[in-house]
Interface confidence: low
């Protein structure tokens, strides 16, 4: 039929990168490129029915469905989904084709189904069959990794039994401190299961599928480091596999290490031992302990002895589940406007956490950094000076925990007002919470000096939106002030400012800003 | 929940010196802002001094040069040293943090 427009229909998904996230925008910021969805003509409908291919969507993805439309004239079109009409409002791109969209911004169930597309051409009606469903993704797991032995090698394992299969990687690094973050040029990836270089200073397994990454660090001690002024400690639940790796460098290979438990020494195959020389002529020895199946009566202090240094120890401590310790107490914080500040949050968890900092409804990514004593710490600064409520949340997989944050940001107020034909309200958001005063201009007072007190009626309210107070202050008309000029000024310790309403005028009321 | 109390008002003749305290109970004062207010009898009440969380002062212009604003983190305490103290000074002092107001104590200039 030659009547029937050419018809493209294509999926657009939006990347979630943080430079969207938090923006109230209503259009998604960064795209992939559209990936076309056929829209092919369906064959026996009654009427002219374009079926785009099936859509699958990951939960909380964006997308957005749009159709291309090669057709002479203006269009005019409806969405419908689950028998609601939806607004449409098509536009021409460059090449003077008709565009219709539809976003989706971060999918949910309620928003997986059919979406119809009627539209009307100056030659022909057609509708468009878009079928969204969400990705099942029940069955994916992401385990975080743990280490075997290898058979008859000196080598170890990383296994993490996920769905879909994960890759894994070990992630390595010979250099203290910060130079170990994962970007830095001091660290090596290997994408393989076995590792047979066990002398690097940092050792991590990583495994990563479609639901993220989940990395386990080989725990150390290392002789030649200076001990840590709180001892270090490893949390394991019951049937997890312990590993504990010590490390030591000698000028020559004339020591040797052991491994005891509470003062006895570790049972044989409990334990083994490897050395290497260094570049510069030193020997290197580890000893590895480990215990494939932990219990209760495998917690305690392991301490390493070496003939040539000082003994060092851990605590182990075996737990039945996981669990996330900190203060979860509110916290309240005031600051100026151009004040550096951040939130942070101090906790121990095991296994480790996954968090997100959540401001009036928006989500944003959570960095947690390990600090000596065993706690980790979770940092939030882009607030941006925005004043209300900040929600931290982390959670692994048997505790969740959440703290509040209040954000007071120090400003002088700003009037907003508004009348009524029976009173007069002025609104400030200013913080410290502003003090109100109503002054009456008149002849008598040209300059307003004429305090109003009868009538006037203080509140603070909450904007649930942001957590953020406001204060608001209502002036009851009287006879007395019927018709004048009346002045409502907000003030606190950082200034004063005032709006001047005319009271009784007819149609809108002028109000004029005073500051 | 921060609680607030003020202490040290009491009467002085023109010219006289008083030292103010305020005592908070709550972890975040040492991360927080504290004003001194006044309210003298039938006026509005007025802020008279500021001390940040890094130490940096300020002070209601009139005041600056008689009131000294100060803190002591580990007590938790807040002082306002009040200088030549002159019978408009008369009022009832409180001390703030976030939303959180004290008493107030009783400051009267009198010969």
């Known amino acids: 039929n030659q009547d029937l427009p050419v018809i493209k229909c294509v999926l657009i998904n939006h990347k979630n990168n943080d430079s969207s996230v938090g923006k109230s925008s209503s259009y998604p910021m960064v795209s992939e490129s559209p990936e076309d969805l056929g829209c092919a003509l369906r064959p026996q409908s009654s009427g002219t029915v374009y079926e785009a291919a099936a859509v699958e969507v990951d939960v909380s993805a964006s997308i957005t469905l749009q159709v291309l439309v090669d057709a002479p004239g203006n269009i005019s079109c409806l969405w419908v989904f689950k028998h609601s009409s939806l607004n449409c409002q098509p536009h021409f791109d460059l090449q003077n084709r008709g565009v219709v969209s539809m976003v989706i911004l971060k999918m949910t169930e309620t928003q997986a189904g059919e979406y119809l597309l009627f539209i009307q051409s100056e030659a022909t009606n057609y509708t468009i069959l878009f079928t969204v469903s969400i990705r099942n993704t029940l069955l994916y797991t992401l385990r975080r990794p743990y280490f075997r032995k290898m058979e008859n090698q000196d080598a170890l394992v990383c296994i993490s039994e996920s769905v879909p299969e994960p890759i894994v990687e070990w992630v390595l690094c010979d250099s203290q401190g910060e130079s170990c973050k994962e970007e830095s040029p001091a660290v090596v990836k290997k994408e393989e299961k076995v590792l047979h270089e066990l002398f690097g200073t940092d050792i991590r397994c990583c495994a990563r599928n479609e639901l993220g990454r989940e990395c386990t660090r080989l725990f150390t001690i290392d002789l030649n480091q200076t001990p840590q002024t709180t001892l270090p400690q490893l949390f394991l639940k019951v049937g997890e596999p312990l590993w504990i790796r010590c490390k030591a460098v000698h000028v020559n290979h004339g020591f040797g290490l052991t491994w005891e438990l509470e003062n006895k020494a570790l049972e044989e195959g409990n334990y083994f031992e490897m050395s290497t020389y260094s570049t510069n002529r030193t020997m290197i020895r580890i000893l590895f302990a480990f215990v494939s199946s932990v219990a209760r009566n495998d917690t305690g202090y392991y301490t390493c002895s070496s003939s040539k240094h000082p003994s060092q120890s851990a605590l182990v401590t075996i737990v039945e589940k996981g669990f996330i310790n900190a203060t979860n107490s509110s916290e309240d914080y005031e600051i100026d406007q151009y004040e550096e500040f951040c939130f942070s949050v101090r906790f121990k968890a095991y296994p480790q956490i996954r968090c997100t900092w959540t401001f009036s409804r928006k989500s944003f990514p959570c960095e947690q950094k390990g600090l000596d004593n065993g706690y980790s710490i979770s940092k939030f600064c882009n607030h941006k000076h925005q004043p209300g409520e900040y929600i931290f949340h982390a959670e692994n997989d048997d505790a969740q925990f959440t703290k509040m944050f209040t954000l007071n940001i120090r400003r002088k107020p700003q009037v907003l007002a508004e009348a009524s034909a029976s009173q007069a309200s002025c609104f400030s958001d200013g913080y410290p919470l502003p003090s109100w005063t109503w002054k009456k201009c008149s002849d008598k007072s040209p300059n307003c000096t004429e305090e109003i007190t009868e009538g006037v009626w203080n509140r603070k309210a909450n904007r649930k939106v942001f957590g953020q107070w406001v204060s608001s202050s209502t002036l009851n008309m009287s006879e007395a002030i019927k018709g004048f000029l009346v002045k409502c000024c907000a003030y606190n310790s950082l200034g004063t400012s005032c709006e001047t309403i005319l009271l009784n005028s007819p149609g809108p009321f002028p109000f004029i800003q005073d500051n | 929940q921060v609680q607030l109390q003020e202490s040290g008002g009491g009467l002085v003749q023109p010219g006289g010196s008083l030292r103010l305290s305020c005592a908070a109970s709550?972890?975040?004062?040492?991360?927080?802002?504290i004003d001194w207010y006044r309210q003298a009898p039938g006026k509005q009440r007025e802020w008279v001094a500021q001390?940040?969380?890094?130490?940096?002062?300020h002070y209601e212009p009139s005041l600056k040069g008689r009131f000294t604003i100060s803190r002591d983190n580990a007590k938790n305490t807040a002082y306002l040293q009040m200088n030549s103290l002159k019978p408009e000074d008369t009022a009832v002092y409180y001390c703030?943090?976030?939303?959180?107001w004290g008493q107030g104590t009783q400051v009267t200039v009198s010969s």
């Open positions: 703030r943090i976030l939303d959180y």
């Open positions: 709550g972890s975040t004062f040492g991360r927080n802002y």
């Open positions: 001390i940040t969380s890094g130490g940096n002062t």
